[in-house]
Interface confidence: medium
Amino acid sequence: GPETLCGAELVDALQFVCGPRGFYFNKPTGYGSSIRRAPQTGIVDECCFRSCDLRRLEMYCAPLKPTKAA
């Protein structure tokens, strides 16, 4: 049956997928956009109440930021 991911296990899996980038519990939308949007479906809705795969988890990783050469 479908598997769900909740609580600390959800955080652990997000850390596995996202690494130190961090993650959001609500999917960021329209980076740089000032348009107000309807409330987003969050990762708890998608992965705890329903089931999701690792690619779905990746959608909640913080966006990649350009990094300067050290």
Epitope: E3, L5, C6, D12, A13, F16, G19, P20, L64, T67
Partner: antibody, heavy 115, light 105 residues
Framework: QVELVESGGGLVQPGGSLRLSCAAS????????MSWVRQAPGKGLEWVSY????????GYADSVKGRFTISRDNSKNTLYLQMNSLRAEDTAVYYC????????WGQGTLVTVSS | DIVLTQPPSVSGAPGQRVTISCTGS????????VHWYQQLPGTAPKLLIY???KRPSGVPDRFSGSKSGTSASLAITGLQSEDEADYYC?????FGGGTKLTVLG
């Protein structure tokens, strides 16, 4: 000390099934997510599957999705990989690895898929 | 998807310093932790460097890791014959193709 010991590998025909096991000791088993990683002969490492520390969540590489099932028994400190519909390209040494950094690995078990 | 590119092989004489690069594709690996693994011939991989530059206990300080922009590097100083092995970088569940290190002489 941490020890991971895989077993269950062998020769199987294409389309066949095999179940791998990974027995763990030397650490708090139920606190760590686990993964299976494989290495085809003469090739590099390929992550296969992930299971969360309580076992309620699993993830798979696209190459094995729908054919392989990862599971764990936290009462026996054992990780499993059920492999169905095996293909020649699944031939590899299969390793279990601890945590999200793969900080400890088993010695590996060889799976050969051939007719 | 992230693709990590490593040189297929590097070599050096005993006592020398060698570096192995790990370059990310379109995704910028600068925001990820990079881990390095050593695989001696006929053995399982072993974690060598984690979180870009940290060494697990028991790993000699001849091994060091660094990261800059879209690439990471593993440096080995004072090369020894027992360092001859395959080296892999990784980010989360993605591995580089591996680099075979040959110690000359």
């Amino acid at each position: 000390q941490v020890e991971l010991v895989e077993s269950g590998g062998g020769l199987v025909q294409p389309g066949g099934s095999l179940r791998l096991s990974c027995a763990a000791s030397g650490f708090t088993w139920s606190s760590f997510a686990m993964s299976w990683v494989r290495q085809a002969p003469g090739k590099g490492l390929e992550w296969v599957s992930y299971i969360s520390y309580l076992g309620s969540y699993t993830g798979y590489a696209d190459s094995v999705k729908g054919r392989f099932t990862i599971s764990r028994d936290n009462s026996k400190n054992t990780l499993y990989l059920q492999m169905n519909s095996l293909r020649a390209e699944d031939t590899a040494v299969y390793y279990c690895a601890r945590g999200t950094k793969f900080d400890y690995w088993g010695q590996g078990t060889l799976v050969t898929v051939s007719s | 998807d992230i693709v990590l590119t490593q040189p297929p092989s590097v070599s050096g004489a005993p006592g020398q310093r060698v570096t192995i690069s790990c370059t990310g594709s379109s995704s910028n690996i600068g925001t990820y932790d990079v881990h390095w693994y050593q695989q001696l011939p006929g053995t399982a991989p072993k974690l060598l460097i984690y979180s870009n530059s940290k060494r697990p206990s028991g790993v000699p300080d001849r091994f060091s890791g660094s990261k800059s922009g879209t690439s990471a590097s593993l440096a080995i100083t004072g090369l020894q014959s027992e360092d001859e092995a395959d080296y892999y970088c990784s980010i989360t569940r993605v591995f580089g193709g591996g680099t075979k290190l040959t110690v000359l002489g």
